[in-house]
Structures are given as C-alpha cells and as structure tokens.
C-alpha cells in the first residue's frame, strides 16, 4: 500500500484547511490509527491529533477545538483531518503517520500554505496645485502573504514607483503615483488595483483628483460700448473665471466707491438705469485658496444728446 496526500494545501486566512492523508492499500488491509503532527524545521514538532479507527479523534491540547474529522460519509482508509479557521501561524509542514494492519507504518508530509489577503489603503499626497512639478498624487499600500501586486488604473499621465517590505510571515507593498498637476486632471479618477491569489477579484480603491488652480479673470458686458448710454436699463458686467476650489468674486470701483443702486450679485455687477455717474473704472477681484486674479474695465456712459451734437458739429465742419 501507499499514502496519498498533496504536496501543498492552500487556504485563505480564516478558512478550514483539509489535510489529506489516504491509505491506498491492498484488499483486507486496515488502518488502525493516523497520527498528525506539525513538523516544521527549526520550529519544533507539535502533535495535532490521533485518529483511531475504533475510538475516533483525539486532538492534542495545543490544537484543542481546532481539528476535526471531515463530515461523513468517511472511508475507513481516509486519515484526513480538518484544521479549522487557518491562521498565518499554521503555515508550515505537516506529517501524517499511518499505522496499518498488516502492512505496518507509513508516513507522508505536506505543506500548508495560508494566503493572507491584503487590506489595501490609499493615502492621497499633498494638495495638488497647477504649476507644481512632479508631485505625489497618492500612495497605495497592501500587506499580505504572499506579497500582493499593486498597480494603478487611470487616464491621467503619470509615473509609478513601488517598494516592498518583508515581514516574518508577510510582505507589504507600497506603490506611489506621481504626476505634474494640471487643471485638466480635475475630477479624474485615480484607482489603485490590488491583486492577490487570496482574492476572488482585484480590490480597487478610487481617489478623485483635485488640482487647485485659478484661471485668468475677464469681464463681459462691454462688448458693445454703444449700449452703455444714459437711461439704459438692465446693464450688467459679468466677471469670468474658473478655479478649484471654486472662486469667490468681489467688485470695486477704482476711482471711488460703487455708485448707489449698483447691485453686487457674486460674479455679476448690476446697474440701475445708467447715468453719467456710473462712468468709471470697475475692478473684478477673483480669489480662491490657491490664488487671486484681477480684471478691470472702463465704463463710459454715453449721453446721446452730446453724441448727436458732436455729430452735427462734425457734419458742419466738413
């Protein structure tokens, strides 16, 4: 006869490990007892259990409550046992010693491999600002056994670098993603992808990029100067800019206080019916936590009567 077992048994942390040991004997041969022990080199041997054909399972004090027989139906030649709730410390060599009648004793060894799935964590780098050079966008760390694979999934152009730290029974892998921040990256996903044999599918953690910037400011509303004449209603100036975080707007008049009746509504400056006192230099001040910008325009409110008088003069002058 001979013993049938596996060279390697692989389980995920927390699962039950079936340690196989089957005696393939000739007809009439019987298994009297199976002894299971852990036999790591350098770690010392430790009995797990005795499996007696008549009296059943006797688990050693060190493994009490953790070793069971597989559920029925059971073959009397099957000396397999279940190691419940495998932990990382269970990883190692195991020996099955089988006492048979009349053939004598046989033994076989197997290696138990306990996969420890990683629990990845993603840490954003420092605040990203337009105009910076190559900057850390995020780092992703995953520790497991064996060492996990850490990669990045993104449309953003950047560079990655990885490092690994070996511990006694596991390895931690950290990958960093660096980029040159630009406003086009705002809102773009940066996804850390962790692969590991103990995972049914890759684990993904997504970070949304936020790049601080502030665009140049400009003022709209003065495209047609002829519309800015005395008596016109609904005249307004709108300050144009964009930024991250969203900017705030402030209006001032360079050559004095804002005239009475002028309404400030965020990026918009609304005028009452125009008079000549609304003529002046207006400044839009745009700011966010990252920067500030100014844009100024000159408003010249036309008096239609003056304009027509000038025209007559010009005509007669000709």
């Amino acid at each position: 006869g001979e013993l049938e077992t596996s060279d390697v048994v692989t389980v995920v942390l927390g699962q039950d490990a079936k340690l196989p040991c089957f005696y393939r004997g000739d007809s009439g041969e019987q298994v009297g007892q199976v002894a299971w022990a852990r036999v790591d080199a350098g770690e010392g041997a430790q009995e797990l259990a005795l499996l007696h054909s008549k009296y059943g399972l006797h688990v050693s004090p060190a493994y009490e409550g953790r070793v069971e027989q597989p559920p029925p139906p059971r073959n009397p030649l099957d000396g397999s046992v279940l190691l419940r709730n495998a932990v990382q410390a269970d990883e190692g060599e195991y020996e099955c010693r089988v006492s048979t009648f009349p053939a004598g004793s046989f033994q076989a060894r197997l290696r138990l491999r306990v996969l420890v799935p990683p629990l990845p964590s993603l840490n954003p780098g420092p605040a990203l600002e337009e105009g910076q050079g190559l900057t850390l966008a995020a780092s992703c760390t995953a520790e497991g056994s064996p060492a996990p694979s850490v990669t990045w999934d993104t449309e953003v152009k950047g560079t990655t670098s990885s490092r690994s730290f070996k511990h006694s029974r596991s390895a931690a892998v950290t990958s960093e993603f660096h980029l040159v921040p630009s406003r086009s990256m705002n809102g773009q996903p940066l996804t850390c992808v962790v692969s590991h044999p103990g995972l049914l599918q890759d684990q993904r953690i997504t970070h949304i990029l936020h790049v601080s910037f502030l665009a140049e400011a400009s003022v709209r509303g003065l495209e047609d100067q002829n519309l800015w004449h005395i008596g016109r209603e609904g005249a307004m100036l709108k300050c144009l800019s964009e930024g991250q975080p969203p900017p705030s707007y402030n209006w001032t008049r360079l050559d004095g206080p804002l005239p009475s009746g002028v309404r400030v509504d965020g990026d918009t400056l609304g005028f009452p019916p125009l008079t000549t006192e609304h003529s002046g230099i207006y400044v839009c001040h745009v700011s966010n936590e990252f920067s500030s910008r100014d844009s100024q325009v000159t408003v010249d409110v036309l008096d239609p009567q003056e304009d027509s008088g000038k025209q007559v003069d010009l005509v007669s002058a000709s």
């Epitope: 022990a37 041997a45 430790q46 009995e47 005795l50 009296y55 006797h58 050693s60 004090p61 009490e64």
Partner: antibody
Framework: EVQLLESGGGVVQPGRSLRLSCAAS????????MHWVRQAPGKGLEWVAV????????YYADSVKGRFTISRDNSKNTLYLQMNSLRAEDTAVYYC?????????????WGQGTLVTVSS | DIVMTQSPSSLSASVGDRVTITCRAS??????LAWYQQKPGKVPKLLIY???TLQSGVPSRFSGSGSGTDFTLTISSLQPEDVATYYC?????????FGQGTKVEIK
C-alpha cells in the same frame, strides 16, 4: 521491538551528583519525546522531566527544578538525567519512558528502571 | 498545579467481578487522561489514553470513560492477571502528574 535500558544508578551521599543514562532501540529515537519518571520504594509514580524529540524544549517537576538536567544525544540514541545536589527524598527507581509521539506526554514504553539510593 | 486523586486506594474483588476505579482532577483536563497498570515488581504499562482509547494489545475487558474532572477505569470481569496497581495520569500540560494509585487484589 522497542527497548529502553537505564543505567547509572547506585548509592550516593546527599549533596553529591549522579548521571543516569537510557539507551533506546527499536524505534526512531529522534522522532519522539522522552521522559524520566521515578518511583520511591513502596510509593506511587512521579513524573520528573521531559525533553522534546530534538532537545530544544525541556520541562521539570518543581521538586527537581534547578537540580536535575535532562538531555539527549540523538546520534547515540541515548537519554540522560544529570542529578545534582541529591537529597534523601530523591531515592527512587528511575524509569525512562518513551512519549507516544513528538509531545503527547503520555508513555507507551518504559525501561526496566535503575535504582538511585541517596544515603549518608 | 492540578492534583489527581484516585479512589479507592485499594480494593479486593473476586475473579469475574466488575471493578471500577475513579480518578478526579482538581481542574478540568478535557479528555487528556491516561491509565497505566503496574504489576508487582514490573514496569508500568499503558492501558488507555484519551480517557477511553484502548492501547493496542490491551484486553477488551478494560475500558475508560469520563471527561473534564471525573474519570473511570472499568475492568468488566476481573482476572487473576489483573492484580496490579493502577495509575491515572493527566497530560494536558506540565507537570504531567499521576494519581496516587489504586491497588487491586483478588479475594
């Protein structure tokens, strides 16, 4: 056939030392824990010490701790018990016993024993 | 340390009688208990381990039971060759102490 043969017993004065040996045969000595158990004349069994199959772990009864040392030489298939600072109450037949496995700590084979008498 | 107490210390019974020896642990030891037989002038012999598992070659008239703190060795039909002292031993943790023994004689 498993055989365990103790030697080294005798009469010794209190405070002196003695070294017992146990020669093993008939099994793979290096795969089993080994124990010393003693029995005072007309008394019961008292577990004394254990050594693991590879010699890396040793445990002692409180009554002998610090005075007795258990050791083994797997290349010679031999178990030893070094007994120092002997006392009258150490008088007993000393048995070496084979562990049922690596470290089950019960005994399926016993030697014939060697008598140690501590007397002035 | 856990103390193992056997009772009775000695007993006398007739051939064919059913004999029961008890062993009590001062703390629970699950089923980590062995029984040994020591005939006069002989070395101890393993009878039972795991409280109830009969060692190979031991006659089936011997049986063991119990778990936790209370254990029993039973000889279903006492034979003349069973005259001996019987010891229980706990092996869950060091020290691996024995009971004080029970001497069995034939009436």
């Amino acid at each position: 056939e498993v055989q365990l043969l103790e030697s080294g017993g005798g009469v010794v004065q209190p405070g002196r030392s003695l070294r017992l040996s146990c020669a093993a045969s008939g099994f793979t000595f290096s795969s089993y824990g080994m124990h010393w158990v003693r029995q005072a004349p007309g008394k019961g069994l008292e577990w004394v010490a254990v050594i693991s199959y590879d010699g890396s772990n040793k445990y002692y009864a409180d009554s002998v701790k610090g005075r007795f040392t258990i050791s083994r030489d797997n290349s010679k298939n031999t178990l030893y018990l070094q007994m120092n600072s002997l006392r009258a109450e150490d008088t007993a037949v000393y048995y070496c016993a084979k562990d049922y496995g690596y470290n089950w700590n019960f005994f399926d084979y016993w030697g014939q024993g060697t008598l140690v008498t501590v007397s002035s | 340390d856990i103390v193992m107490t056997q009772s009775p210390s000695s007993l006398s019974a007739s051939v064919g009688d059913r004999v029961t020896i008890t062993c009590r642990a001062s703390q629970g030891i699950s089923n980590y208990l062995a029984w040994y037989q020591q005939k006069p002038g002989k070395v101890p012999k393993l009878l039972i381990y795991a409280a109830s598992t009969l060692q190979s070659g031991v006659p089936s008239r011997f049986s063991g039971s119990g778990s936790g703190t209370d254990f029993t060795l039973t000889i279903s039909s006492l034979q003349p060759e069973d005259v001996a002292t019987y010891y229980c031993q706990k092996y869950n943790s060091a020290p691996y102490t024995f009971g004080q023994g029970t001497k069995v004689e034939i009436k």
